[in-house]
Amino acid sequence: QQQTLPKPFIWAEPHFMVPKEKQVTICCQGNYGAVEYQLHFEGSLFAVDRPKPPERINKVQFYIPDMNSRMAGQYSCIYRVGELWSEPSNLLDLVVTEMYDTPTLSVHPGPEVISGEKVTFYCRLDTATSMFLLLKEGRSSHVQRGYGKVQAEFPLGPVTTAHRGTYRCFGSYNNHAWSFPSEPVKLLVTGDIENTSLAPEDPTFPADTWGTYLLTTETGLQKDHALWDHTAQNLLR
């Protein structure tokens, strides 16, 4: 006899990276007929929603109108059908950004390289942080984590044209509180000398739309909850 229901999916709209003082909605999708959803924050009950009518609703939303560092952390949700509770969802890491300072991002040997060259990004922030995050803008969140007193190295190794794109970095004051994003660095990777055609890449956003990027639901993440859970879970681990 089944003792628990399947775990629900959890995700954040428009994005799990939320600039401070902006709004975010945490979504929890369970099953039709669920009479109660509970949202847990850092292991404690945070909010409850009882959908009406439960047989016509399989998703609830928990709205956070004003993001701040106290609201950043790990969320999970569960739901109940009758007296039977579900397994807890995967953990959602909700991150507050635009905290304190702005790092600088640079690239070695430079912003235009030939396929096969070794490329390293450097993220520098002079204030009190030792963890840095490098993100490639695009449809999926390519995130690397690095450490250093004021500057972290992010070796990409020998690059291919798939590494083309626009990169930003953040300083991280803790796992869930990040700095303002750096200015973008666009990496151009050409083929060999004879063939400088450029390969397709993730769609990138213009530098002046980074704020919009943070506040735009990434394509497919709502539809592909497994990908969303995977991205959110592995981002900071």
Partner: nanobody, 122 residues
Framework: DVQLVESGGGSVEAGGSLRLSCAAS??????MGWFRQAPGKAREGVAC??????????DYADSVKGRFTITQDNAKNTVYLQMNSLKPEDTAMYYC???????????????WGQGTQVTVSS
Amino acid sequence: DVQLVESGGGSVEAGGSLRLSCAASGYRQRTMGWFRQAPGKAREGVACIYTGPTTTFTDYADSVKGRFTITQDNAKNTVYLQMNSLKPEDTAMYYCAANLAYPLTIIPDTRWGQGTQVTVSS
């Protein structure tokens, strides 16, 4: 190993010009630049240049934009800093740097010259 030799420093009145040169021996340097340090102050970036496969990129500190120009002669493996409209606050020891990250970032493998003094009087 890379050796960097600067030249072209000197004294000039405000509004004048100087041209600094930095010759790099050894392998060709793709990202080279200039930093400066005034007495009692921290070292600060001035300008850098990166030669990519098809494009040359330059970056300048806000305080020198429109007044200083960095160029590179790949054949001579030399970088130049043309400094126009000099101000007293440009007075400093100017250091050539090679193997930077772009834009204008010191990394563990950055190499340094001995420096050349620039003095701008009012």
